[in-house]
């Protein structure tokens, strides 16, 4: 089997964590939301050829039927493997309050 | 805010959950799975259009900035939320085997 | 360089109030909060609250309700701190510091040099 | 509010020692922890934060460890410079409070 992190369509094609450079106003929460007043926004972009970075065997299945029925069976999807937790400063109705998300930024990546 | 389940772009398009008839052939399971001889395979297909289904403040965000930066940052995509197990009947070195695995079926969907 | 300097030290007779300024330089006012914190003589650290220096939102300490405002002027790239109704027990030194915020969390990176205020009749 | 208590209150230590704080939480704060050092007559200043990421400019011999509601600061080997109050922060949550402080004196 090829090595489950080895790309082969070239350095940096296939499903990784980038970083995108977003402010308050780009995630739609400038209304509620109060800091930080902008974020490093971690996610999981590229592509999932096959034996890449699988997350189970449902992705394994999932590329096999891909092969054979493209226009029925998508291939699979880079996603977060998990997520590190963030914090925000947000208005609530009372007035302010510091809240931990645990789903925001993606830690790491895989295809599922 | 829309209804989560309600999809914009008519019915059956958006991400939700697929069966798909497959051989052991197909799935490539031919050389090591005695038993079932086909399986429906459940998998999540479909768009993930804004505030469909989104699994987490994750893909509210990937949403925001696919819609800001399209060619920079995918849309959140149609992956499984949980799954169904499912028992193979495997050859094994030392003979024949009862597997459960647990993650081989979508049982829901969401998008991430 | 960053740097936050605070008004001179006080003297002010129970009932009264003080109002304390913190100058911030070397950096967008805008860009980082501010937190106000006091120390009475001997003993700890203790939060007082947070503003944000762009809209001005603020959250106090439960003890300093009623008593404490915080407030900022991005044009001179100030924060103040008023206390009203002084106490004997508000003889401490209050500091201003800035709000580091980022995926790595919130922390206070750089502090003025502290203000004494001294509640005596 | 969540309390923040730090043992032990005070410490004598020799230079090239290893000295260890701890600071416990009275709920689970993530990893939303920072330590600072004080010395008489100055403001605090920032060591540790994210309960393990160092602070620019501060010296490796300053480590953070820990998640939940136990957390560690370690200097590896105790300078003359390093003779002070230090204090745990958590920001997890409003209040933000800070643990009483241990001194670290010359034995």
């Known amino acids: 089997a090829r090595n489950g992190d080895r790309c082969p369509l070239g350095p940096g094609r296939c499903c990784r964590l980038h970083t995108v450079h977003a402010s308050l106003e780009d995630l739609g929460w400038a209304d509620w939301v109060l800091s930080p007043r902008e974020v490093q926004v971690t996610m999981c972009i590229g592509a999932c050829p096959s034996q890449f970075r699988e997350a189970n065997m449902h992705a394994q299945i999932k590329m096999n039927l891909h092969r054979l029925k493209p226009d029925t069976v998508p291939a699979p999807c880079c996603v977060p493997a998990s997520y590190n937790p963030m914090v925000l400063i947000q208005k609530t109705d009372t007035g302010v309050s510091l809240q931990t998300y645990d789903d925001l930024l993606a830690k790491d990546c895989h295809c599922v | 805010a829309r209804n989560g389940d309600r999809c914009p772009l008519g019915p059956g398009r958006c991400c939700r959950l697929h069966t798909v008839h497959a051989s052991l052939e197909d799935l490539g399971w031919a050389d090591w799975v005695l038993s079932p001889r086909e399986v429906q395979v459940t998998m999540c297909i479909g768009a993930c259009p804004s505030q469909f289904r989104e699994a987490n403040m994750h893909a509210q965000i990937k949403m925001n900035l696919h819609r800001l930066k399209p060619d920079t940052v995918p849309a959140p995509c149609c992956v499984p939320a949980s799954y169904n197990p499912m028992v193979l009947i495997q050859k094994t070195d030392t003979g024949v085997s009862l597997q459960t695995y647990d993650d081989l079926l979508a049982k829901d969907c969401h998008c991430v | 360089q960053v740097q936050l300097v605070q008004s001179g030290a006080e003297v002010k007779k129970p009932g009264a109030s003080v109002k304390v300024s913190c100058k911030a330089s070397g950096y967008t006012f805008a860009s980082y909060d501010i937190i106000w914190v006091r120390q009475a003589p001997g003993q700890g650290l203790e939060w007082m609250g947070w503003?944000?220096?762009?809209?001005?939102?603020?959250v106090y300490a439960q003890k300093l309700q009623g008593r404490v405002t915080m407030t900022t002027d991005t044009s001179t790239s100030t924060a103040y701190m008023e206390l009203r109704s002084l106490r004997s027990d508000d003889t401490a030194v209050y500091y201003c510091a800035r709000t580091r915020h980022d995926t790595s969390g919130i922390r206070f990176d750089y502090w003025g040099q502290g203000t004494l205020v001294t509640v005596s009749s | 509010d969540i309390q923040m208590t730090q043992s032990p209150s005070s410490v004598s230590a020799s230079v090239g020692d290893r000295v260890t704080i701890t600071c416990r939480a009275s709920?689970?704060?993530?990893?939303?922890l920072a330590w600072y050092q004080q010395k008489p007559g100055k403001a605090p200043k920032l060591l540790i934060y994210a309960a393990s990421s160092l602070q620019s400019g501060v010296p490796s011999r300053f480590s953070g460890s820990g998640s939940g509601t136990d957390f560690t600061l370690t200097i590896s080997s105790l300078q003359p410079e390093d003779f002070a109050t230090y204090y745990c922060?958590?920001?997890?949550?409003?209040?933000?409070?800070f643990g009483g402080g241990t001194k670290v004196e010359i034995k």
């Open positions: 503003i944000s220096a762009l809209s001005g939102d603020t």
């Open positions: 922060q958590q920001v997890h949550s409003f209040p933000i409070t």
């Open positions: 709920q689970g704060i993530d990893s939303w």
